[in-house]
Structures are given as C-alpha cells and as structure tokens.
C-alpha cells in the first residue's frame, strides 16, 4: 500500500451503528488493498446485520482479483456468507453469531467506486412478538398495531384448539409491504404472513399473504393453526389485525359426507378459485364459476381439453360429489356448457392424479344445457385439497359453474388427526424398521406436509418385514389411519421414486412391547387393508376403535417403485370415544325426498364405513380376490377347460404413460377369427354365503362385434344359475362389472364364461375380481343391461353355452394391460338413482 493511503480495517463494536467503506469511497478505491474488519456485538446472543449502499462497484472477473467477502465468525477460516464484486450490491447479511469478519481485496488493475455498508445490532423484535393462543377467542395483531410494524421481525402466532373444536380466523385489516410488480398471490418478497395448517414449517402451508388484499376467512379443524409474520429491514406498513374464535363441532348422528363445500355459498373464497386461463374480456373469470352464480361463469381464453378450473380447499377434505352447470352469456343470452370432464386431484398443488374408474381415466358426463345442474358422485370418496375440473367436450364453448360436495375427515366421530400432519406429533415420536437414508428425517413420514416420504432401506423387502411407527405420546382411542405414497430421489439412481403401499396391516400397543394386529371383524384374522393406487392421493382406512399409544403400519404389497409411505393416525382422546354408527357416504333416499339433479352412473361407495347386515357370517375363501398380477398360488381362480396358458407379460404400454401404476396383468381370451371360435371358463374357489349377500366387482373388456359374449354363472352341485351376461361388443374400454352374490345355503362356485363365435375375431378380458365390502348392495348392479328381467335357472350345468356351437378350445392367458383404451369404464347412464344433497 502506498504511503499516502489511509489505513483500512479494524475491530468495530456494533453497539453503535456505523459504516465501513472501501478506501476513498465513493471515489475509485486504490489498488493493492487488503483490508480486514471484525465487527462484534457486545452481547453473545446478539447478531449483526449488514446493509449495503446500492452504489456498489468492484471489478468483476468472477471476483478473482477485487472483491469483498463476509465470513460468519472472527477469522478467515469462518463460514463464508458471501463473496461479492460487480455492480450489484449484496443483499442484507445477518450473522448467526455475535461476530462478522469482512475482507476487501483489490489488485493492481481496474478500480471502481467500491462499497459502503452499514453495520448494526440485528434487532429482531421477535423475542417478544410470538404468542400462543388457547382461549375460546382472541385478537392477533402485528406488533405495534395500529402503528406501523417494526423491521426484521419473525413472529409466530399459534392457535391451539381442543379436539372437536374448529378454529375460525377472520382478518379485519391487512396491509403488508409487497412488490408492485408481483405476479401471483403468494409471490411475496419483502414482508409476508404465512398461515400453516399445524406447526410452522411442519404442517402444510395454507397460504402466503402480502399487499393489501385481506385473506379470506379460514376454518381449520386440525386442532392447530399457525401464523408466521416476517418483515425485512425496509418499508413498513400498517400491518394486520385478525380475530379468531373456536367453535365446537358436533356433527349430527346421521351425518352424511355430502355437504356443499362452499362454491355457491361463498365459503370457498375467491382467492381459492383459479384456472389455467380466463377469457380475455375479464367477464368470465374463475371466480364466476360458482353454482347458480347469476353473472356468466368461467370460460378459458381458448377452448381446449388442456384447460382447467381449480379449487384449493385449503385443508385435506373428503370429496364425494361434483355438481356442474353451464352458463348463459349476459352479453348474448347464448348458452355454453361442458358436456364431459375429467377430474384431477392433488394434496399439494403440484402432484396431480387423474381420477380413474378401474384402469381408465373417468370421463364424467356433465351438462346437456346451460342451466340445469348435473350431479356426479364419485364411486369412492377422495381425500384431497386441490381439485381440477378439466373439460373434455363442450357445447359452443367451455363455460362452467360448479359446486363440490363432501366433508372433512374430522367430521366423522373420533376421527381427529392425531398430529402427523400438523406436527403435534414430534419427529422423535416417529420411527421405522429401517430407512433408506443414513441420516433420516422422521418428518418425511408426515401425511401431506412432507414432500417426500418414508422409504425403507430395502425398497423390495419381504411382506410384513418393514414398518413405520408412531408414538402418540399418551394412550388414545385409535380408529383409523390415512396413508399416502411417497416421492423422492433415490440415493442409488437419480430417478425420483414414486412409490406407494398397495396393501398393509396395522398393529398397535399400549406399551411399545406387546403388539396386536387390527383384526377383520368378519374373519377374526389379521385385517389386510387396501392401500394406495397413486403416490400422492391419500386413502383413509378405518377400523373398530382400539386403545393404543403406539401404532405401526406394515406394508404387505407395494408399487413397482417399492415401499414408500406417509401417514396420519385418526382417533380421539381415550375418554372421548363412544360407539356410533358412521356413514360417510351420501345416502340414497326415496324419490319424493330427493333433489332434482340428474346423476352420473356411479353410486358413491363409502369406503371402510359400509357394512353388510350380517358381516360375521361372511367367510371369504382365500384367493377369491384376484388381480392376476401375482403367481398362481396367490389366486384361487382356476381354468378348467384346457391347459392354463400363461403368456409372456409383454406390455404394449408406452413406458412414459403411467396409465397403470402397478396392476399390469389380466386374463385374456382371444380369437383371431379361427374357424372353431373360442370358449373359456374361469372358476372361483368355493364360496359359502348362508346368510349374507355380497357384492362382487370386476373389470372387463369385450371386443369383437356380435360374436362375443361374457357371462357369470353360479354353479352349485345340482344347479347352475346365470347371474349376469353381456352379448355384444363393449368397445375397447375397460368397464366395471358388479354383481350381487345372493345368500345361498349350499357351497357354490362363480364361473366366468367367455365366448368368441366361430370365425370371429375378438377378445374378452377379465381383471380385478373381488368381493367389495365397500359397495351398498343397491349399487351392486353394473351394467344394468347385463341383468335380464327374469333369467331362467338352468340345471345340470347347462346354460348359455348350449347356444354355442360344439367345442371350443379355451385360451385364457395372462396378459399385460394395454394403454390404448382410455375411455370410460362404465357404460351409459345405467342408473336413475336420485341422491339427496341434504346432510
């Protein structure tokens, strides 16, 4: 350094704020500088904040020659917080401890104006701004309200409610600094308020808010709602004021999960409704998509099946039905409406699942005019937060008005979420048999709030070998679990695993040592629960209440990507539970009490909540439920007419098309037009149902014109009864069959008989045969056309096959699914049930 340059560097106490500049600032700094400053705070728990003057100019060249560097400590060996050059001033820098090291270096060549920074003690204001709220009502305000809020705040406000209490949060005023160029809601750069469903940064984020748009009323039934308030060191505004109150939730005894969720009423706020695009005149916005809204509806900018209307329900919600209308243009009085649509759901707004019926995307038949309401019920309720309606066909143009029906998980008796999602269950209470990552974060196993999930060390372990465990902290009454798949990069391959558990068992314990499995009340055997069909969409599985502090879930079968799981446990405090009858599915009522909404063909099933009148007598043979994906011993159905052929499982599916997550194989009877035709029988294990009728479900395809027939026969020792028959081409789509197996005092077998006539080309496929414990018997006739008014009984095993010429060589072979048929697996409008929408 030359003699005339003033010295630079030093040790500075930040008790009094001050400035550090490059020598000569704002004139060009000299060459050959090597300045070092140490800035320290007087108290060990204090931090230091540096704010740079925007007039910043240091020779660039990747900061090789001239630069300023800041380290999080008192020497050159401390962690680097930033190394800066060029002409863009660094952002605000805050130390983690009570000291910062700053170094400025210049070489012999080009110079610039240099830098100027202000240092001071970092005053958070946060030490005394965080609060917990437990009283029945209260006010939450930004610090100092109604005055402007302080800088550098990070405050947390947590509202805690007892079980069965709903938290309602209503903002009265709201004004936080925001970027005037901000594109979308939630793009908050400077000051913001985050609202969390649970503990901050653990539970799901409901929304991020800034600017002057007041957040709409929030209703949470998770038991904990948190707000985190962040402010920066610049502009301060008036802040916010909100009222909260707790309301006791007691659903009526006969509660049905078909409550309007709030499109028509406005309970779903405008900010929760969005779309892929909106018509450019601003008169057909997503916010105009409310059922019976009197001002147009939603219309996209261009009509295409890539457009969608989206609703964010904010919290995980059971969706059971969707009602749609078209809209009449105020400007022309012309009507526009959607004739069919697909449904997509997501728990996080990023991972979407197209709703299916069987193997195919379900295409819902919607409106036939612009004003009538058409209600489509889901054949299985969906647990979701985000919903997208994606129009497929329309009249004149897409126009949509909408209502959603359902309920919250917690509306059912003793169904509080016990804390995996919200974070009330701490990480230390979550454990597993093994984990893929060496340093595993137990938070990964949390329902929805985790972006990844739990993966065991061996993704293809033995059934029942791996488990995920939750310690509830104290004994609770446990009544169910919600399971969800998982996603995350594999440490071995760069591919993101999208895994889920297809079947599982649940065990429980009060002490962590003595374990019992949840039993199937019908068989008194360990219950094997149906799991997920997709890595994002969660499924609720309920069971009779058990006392437990520890709950374990054991995967038994899983997706090709292996075991992956996220979890929530449902229940209530040990003293809370009282036996009640639950029905979370919409009810069927007589016609005179129904609302006049035309119905889609699918009747709602009610998950684990339905039961038959006399379940204890149902003894299902092992191997009756069969999806033909596993080796023969797992499936009790036999082929009795010729040699069982297992063809190679060659998939014709596009590997990028995830049409079938796992269930890739099915039985196929095929004929290429040979002279003698085809005939094949598929026979169930023996069934004995002396008292209880049950519902048998299956998937089928039948292609080949008038030459194909598929029938289902009940064969007992002395007689045979035709139960179901289709006698013509059903198209290339997979369809859903349902048949009531009536009670019968003798043992019998179910036989599928497929026929392809002489010289005909065609194929008949069968898959996913199972007894459904979920479907009310009144909904167990599908398609209705397969049930003759009076099918005569036949004896001696002679039935419809008498109409078939001579002998056939049967060829049921195990085949892989093709993704070509993307139609609706249900045929036509087969049912005319009308459903009540009243709870």
């Amino acid at each position: 350094r030359s003699q005339q340059d003033p010295p630079c560097g030093g040790r500075l106490n930040s008790k009094d704020a001050g400035y550090i500049t490059s020598p000569g600032y704002p004139q060009d700094y000299p060459s050959h500088q090597n300045c070092e400053w140490i800035v320290y705070a007087p108290e060990p728990n204090q931090k230091i904040v540096l704010n740079f003057n925007p007039h910043f100019e240091i020779e660039k060249h990747d900061c090789k020659y001239d630069f300023i560097e800041i380290r999080d400590g008192d020497s050159e060996s401390a962690d680097l917080l930033g190394k800066h050059c060029g002409n863009i001033a660094p952002p605000t820098i805050i130390s983690s401890g009570s000291v910062l090291y700053i170094k400025f270096t210049s070489d012999y060549a080009r110079q610039g104006a240099g830098f100027s920074l202000r240092y001071e003690i970092f005053k958070t204001g946060s030490e005394d701004c965080s609060k917990n709220f437990t009283s029945p009502n209260g006010t939450i305000e930004s610090p100092g309200f109604p005055e402007k809020y302080p800088h550098n705040l990070d405050c947390t406000f947590t509202i805690l409610a007892k079980p069965r209490m709903e938290i309602i949060l209503q903002f009265l005023t709201f004004d936080l600094e925001h970027d005037p160029l901000q594109v979308g809601e939630g793009d908050c750069k400077y000051d913001w308020l985050d609202i969390w469903d649970g503990i901050p940064h653990v539970g799901p984020l409901i929304g991020k808010y800034c600017g002057t748009k007041t957040p709409s009323k929030l209703r949470s039934s998770t038991g904990i709602l948190s707000l985190t308030f962040h402010t920066d060191m610049a502009v301060a505004k008036d802040g916010f004021s909100a009222r909260y109150y707790l309301i006791h939730q007691e659903p009526p005894e006969n509660f049905q999960c078909n409550v309007p969720l709030g499109m028509e009423s406005g309970r779903i706020a405008n900010e929760q409704i969005s779309a892929s695009s909106t018509f450019s005149d601003g008169r057909w916005t997503p916010q105009q998509s409310r059922l019976h809204g009197d001002d147009n509806g939603w219309t996209p900018n261009l009509d295409s099946n890539k457009e969608y209307l989206q609703v964010d329900l904010r919290f995980l919600t059971m969706l059971t039905a969707i009602a749609t209308q078209g809209a009449i243009s105020r400007e022309t009085q012309k009507g526009y409406y959607v004739k069919s649509y697909k449904l997509e759901v997501s728990t996080n707004g990023e991972d979407w699942m197209v709703y299916r019926h069987g193997k195919n995307h379900k295409i819902f038949q919607a409106n036939n005019d612009a004003t009538e309401v058409v209600l489509n019920k889901l054949h299985m309720p969906l647990l979701t937060r985000f919903i997208r309606i994606r129009p497929q066909t329309w009249h004149l143009g897409i126009a949509l008005r909408l209502e959603l029906f359902g309920c919250r998980v917690t509306d059912a008796p003793c169904s509080n979420m016990l804390g995996m999602l919200s974070g009330l269950i701490a990480d230390t209470q979550i454990s597993a048999s093994s984990t893929r990552e060496y340093l595993w974060s137990p938070s990964a196993a949390r329902l929805v709030s985790s972006r990844s999930g739990w993966f065991p060390r061996n993704p293809q372990a033995q059934p029942g070998e791996e488990w995920l465990q939750v310690d509830l902290g104290t004994p609770k009454t446990v009544k169910g679990v919600i399971i969800q798949g998982a996603r995350g990069g594999d440490s071995i391959t760069a591919v993101e695993a999208r895994a889920f558990v297809r079947k599982f068992k649940v065990s429980y314990s009060l002490n962590g040592k003595d374990w019992e499995y949840i039993q199937d009340p019908r068989t008194q055997q360990t219950k094997l629960f149906e799991g997920n069909m997709h890595y994002d969409t969660p499924d609720i599985r309920r069971f009779d209440p058990v006392p437990a502090q520890y709950v374990r879930v054991y995967p038994e079968r899983w997706s090709p990507a292996g075991i992956g799981m996220r979890l929530e446990v449902l229940g209530c405090d040990w003293t809370d539970s009282k036996p009640t009858v639950e029905t979370l599915g919409p009810t069927v009522k007589s016609e005179e009490t129904t609302t006049p909404y035309p119905m889609d063909e699918d009747a709602t099933e009610c998950g684990e909540n339905c039961s038959f009148e006399d379940d204890k007598d149902l003894q299902l043979p092992s191997g009756f439920n069969c999806n033909f994906d596993f080796p023969e011993e797992t499936c009790g159905w036999v082929y009795d007419h010729a040699k069982w052929l297992r063809s190679t499982w060659i998939s014709s599916a596009n590997p990028n098309d995830r049409t079938f997550p796992d269930d890739k194989n099915f039985l196929k009877l095929q004929s290429d037009g040979r002279r003698e035709g085809q005939y094949g029988r598929l026979i169930s294990p023996p069934v004995h149902l002396p008292r209880s009728p049950v519902c048998m479900e299956f998937q089928y395809q039948a292609m080949g014109g008038h030459g194909v027939a598929l029938q289902v026969v009940r064969e007992a020792s002395q007689e045979s009864k035709l139960l179901w028959v289709i006698r013509e081409d059903q198209g290339s789509e997979w369809k859903h069959g349902r048949i009531i197996l009536p009670s019968y005092d003798m043992e019998y077998q179910i036989v599928f008989e497929g026929v392809i006539g002489k010289g005909r080309s065609g194929e008949i496929s069968i898959d996913d045969i199972r007894i459904s414990t979920d479907v009310p018997l009144e909904n167990c006739m599908e398609p209705i056309s397969a049930f003759a008014v009076d099918i005569p009984e036949t004896h001696g095993g002679e039935g419809y096959e008498d109409e078939i010429d001579d002998e056939y060589e049967g060829d049921w072979s195990n085949s892989s699914s093709s993704t070509s048929g993307a139609g609706d697996p249900s045929s036509g409008k087969e049912k005319s049930w009308l459903y009540t929408l009243d709870p």
Epitope: F279, S280, D281, I328, S329, R330, E331, T332, Q333, K334, G335, N368, D369, A370, T371, H395, L396, G397
Partner: antibody
C-alpha cells in the same frame, strides 16, 4: 338440422307482423335463435335473439316494437313487430345462433305498402 | 355499443387474384367475429367463426385473421363462384347495439 320461416306477405302500414320460425333436428333448449332482416338492395340487419334459456335481447331500434317468444315443445320461435312502416319491407330470416349464425332459413319476404 | 365498420364497400378482383376485406369494431370484440357470404336470392352462408376458424365444408382459400378491434377476411385464388356480398358479424355482445353486422362488401370477379 334446419330452420324455416313462415310465409310473409303484404302488410299495411301500422299492421302487426307475426312470423314463426320452425326448427328441426336440434332443441331450442340448447341453441339460441336470432331474427335478421334485409331490405331490398341493403345489408343484413339484426333484430334480436332468444337465448337457449329463454333470455331475450333486442336491437336498440327494435326494442320498442318487437317481441320474440318461443315454444320449446312445438320447436317454434315467433317474432311480432308492431307499427309497421314501408321501411320494414324486407326479407326476414331466422337463424340458429351457435358459435355464429350457422344455420339460416331461406327467408320470407314481407312487403309493407298502403 | 359495438358498431361494425366494413371496408371497402365494393371491390373488383380478377380470377386467381386475392381480395382482402377489413372489418373494424368500435371496441374490442375479443375475436368473437364471423364472416358470411351471401349470393342474390339466398340466405347468408357462414364461412368463418371465432375470427379464424373455418366453418365445415368451406374452402381453405378463405382465411380469417385479426384480434381486438381489427379483423380481416382474405380470399386467395379467387374463383368466379366467389362473386358475392361478404358480411362480418360480431358475436361478442348484443346489448345496446343497433346492428351486429358490418355494412357488407360486394366482391366482383372479372
């Protein structure tokens, strides 16, 4: 799918014109119908529309003396125009109004003369 | 009001030539515009809707374009049979309008 206007004819000034448009092959519950007229040697002039839900809009000049009604059961739309003058002499068309006027009737000539 | 101004009122074109007809709305009609062809003694025939979509059975020699307030119908490779009067029509708003049609353009083919 078609639309057809009833016969026009000769009318005297101050008379009331009643024309009926009969539709076939589609429903008036799903399509709107507009009335349009064309004076000899002139351009097309819109009179009004009845929407598929029954809402009606008239051109400003026609509002005071025109009435459009429909019968979905009979598949008919009726135009009534009062206080006819010689300026109302024109060919009257009814047209199905979908994404545009995609189906037109052949038209019917109405002459107003004393 | 949404007034439609069509230019020119008349145009001559030789067989094989190209003709361009313009339609201007007094305010944006957001591409809700149709074009019609009318021959003497016949009702109009729809050619183009939504500003640029060809109606079924219409020759691809007819092309519609434009957005906002400015729209164009272009007929290329003109044939004798194209001699007719052409009208534009706004389909955006019928409220408080005198007419939804433009004044018409007569195309004479030589």
């Amino acid at each position: 799918q078609s639309v057809k206007e009833s016969e026009g004819g000769l009318f005297k000034p101050t008379d009331t014109l009643t024309l009926t448009c009969t539709v076939s092959g589609f429903s008036l519950s799903t399509y709107s119908i507009s009335w349009v007229r064309q004076a000899p040697g002139n351009g097309l002039e819109w009179i009004g529309i009845i929407g598929d839900a029954g809402g009606i809009i008239y051109a400003t000049w026609a509002k005071s003396r025109s009435t459009i009604t429909r019968s979905t059961a009979l598949n008919t739309v009726t135009l009534k125009m009062t206080g006819l003058t010689a300026a109302d002499t024109a060919t009257y068309f009814c047209a199905r109004d979908g994404t545009a006027f995609d189906i037109w009737g052949p038209g019917t000539l109405v002459t107003v003369s004393s | 009001a949404y007034d439609m101004t069509q230019t020119p009122a008349s145009v001559e074109v030789v067989v094989g030539g190209t003709v361009t007809i313009k339609c201007q709305a007094s305010q944006s009609i957001y591409s809700k515009l149709g074009w019609y062809q009318q021959k003497p003694g016949q009702p109009p025939k729809l050619l183009i809707y939504r500003a640029s979509t060809l109606a079924s059975g219409v020759s691809s020699r007819f092309k519609g374009s434009g957005s906002g307030t400015e729209y164009t119908l272009t007929i290329s490779g003109v044939q004798c049979d194209d001699a007719a009067t052409y009208y534009c029509q706004q389909d955006y708003s019928y409220i408080n309008v005198d007419n939804i049609f433009g004044g018409g353009t007569e195309v004479v083919v030589k």
